[in-house]
């Protein structure tokens, strides 16, 4: 496929990305299979001036990143290293916490009304980010 | 036992615009992804689109610029519209509603309709 | 978008033999994230509409008998079906759902 050279209609171009910002809620891994279905993925953060442009445009609402330890170690989505990256936890978090009463732990990150992140249900209808980086191969043909 | 039943014309005209609609019957439309999927005579499968109760879609790539689909809580129905038709349009149309899990597969389909593309 | 190809485009086999059907992915379809390849198998007979069979390449859906198996990762998928039956002449389609959906082209499968 050819390199994406620009963002598609109602993304928002950054750094060499394009991010796309729902309006409605979904749980994450519906979340996530919309950003799939978009050729792209829940948002990866991975400074802090990232983590600035991001919280800019959700604004102080509860909101998805492709940051999940479902499996047991935390994972970002597109397979960037957690232990090593940029992390913006609140305080006390992530804690994996039990007593929502809503069965298991907290396994999906997300940010909150100040922008650091904390865990919850994967389940909770959130809005979310879809990311996707510029200058990767596009899965479309490219036009003649 | 979720049922699904497409309906609209069977003959639209080149350019045209083709319509059609998926009732969903014995169980709600709420809470699931619902697609349209289209078979051409003897030949394989296209995925059209998807759409959830509060309008969020994904659309195939290669049909976005045509394709627009909505969806009528109150009726149990969503509807695909198909705009500046030509003969390749002609096809058999399914509806069908998403598994669940997060995953666009597919485990309810209705039965199809025939549409033609002819003047 | 992902292409899908299957292998054969038909094949004939004897009743309560076993029939094997491949599809390939042109990109990889595991997603790293949670280790699940997104691949589906339909089931379609003349003038009906496809029966899912298989998701997660190789989960059966509910009810459908468990001479049906499916296996792979990646790239390449196999459905096998084990003692085939007189009913299980069909066209069985593989599917991706890791991106936009797409079908493989189909294999049609007779009795010999």
């Known amino acids: 496929g050819s390199e994406r050279t620009c963002c598609p209609v109602n993304w928002v171009e950054h750094e060499r990305s394009c991010y796309w910002f729902s309006r409605s809620g979904k749980a994450w891994a519906d979340a996530d299979n919309y950003c799939r279905l978009e050729d792209a993925h829940l948002v990866v953060v991975t400074s802090w001036e990232e983590q600035k442009f991001v919280q800019h445009h959700i604004g102080p609402v509860n909101t998805w990143m492709g940051l999940h330890d479902q499996n047991g170690p935390w994972k970002w989505v597109d397979g960037t290293d957690y232990e090593t990256g940029f992390k913006n936890w609140r305080p006390e978090q992530p804690d994996d916490w039990y007593g929502h009463g809503l069965g298991g732990g907290e396994d999906c990150a997300h940010f909150t009304d100040d922008g650091r992140w904390n865990d919850d249900v994967c389940q909770r209808p959130y809005r979310w980010v879809c990311e996707t980086e510029l200058d990767k191969a596009s899965q479309e043909p490219p036009l003649l | 036992q979720v049922q699904l039943q497409e309906s609209g014309p069977g003959l639209v005209k080149p350019s045209e615009t083709l319509s059609l609609t998926c009732t969903v019957s014995g169980g709600s439309i709420s809470n699931y992804y619902w697609s349209w999927i289209r078979q051409p005579a003897g030949k394989g499968l296209e995925w059209i689109g998807r759409i959830d109760t509060s309008g969020i879609t994904n659309y195939n790539p290669s049909l976005k610029s045509r394709v627009t689909m909505s969806v009528d809580t109150s009726k149990n129905q969503f509807s695909l519209k198909l705009t500046s038709v030509t003969a390749a349009d002609t096809a058999v149309y399914y509806c069908?509603?998403?598994?669940?899990?997060?995953?666009?597969?597919?485990?309810?389909w209705g039965q199809g309709t025939l549409v033609t593309v002819s003047s | 978008g992902i292409v899908m190809t299957q292998s054969p485009d038909s094949l004939a086999v004897s009743l309560g033999a076993r029939a094997t059907i491949d599809c390939k992915s042109s990109?990889?379809?595991?997603?790293?994230?949670?280790?699940?390849?997104?691949l589906a198998w339909y089931q379609q007979k003349p003038g009906q509409p496809p029966k899912l069979l298989i998701y997660?390449?190789?989960t059966r859906e509910s009810g459908v008998p468990d001479r049906f198996s499916g296996s792979g990762s990646g790239t390449d998928f196999t459905l096998t079906i084990y003692s085939l039956q007189a009913e299980d002449v069909a066209v069985y389609y593989c599917q991706q759902y890791y991106r936009s959906p797409s079908f493989g082209q189909g294999t049609k499968l007779e009795i010999k």
């Open positions: 997660w390449a190789s």
């Open positions: 990109q990889s379809v595991l997603y790293s994230s949670n280790n699940k390849n997104y």
């Open positions: 069908a509603r998403e598994g669940g899990l997060g995953a666009t597969f597919f485990d309810y």
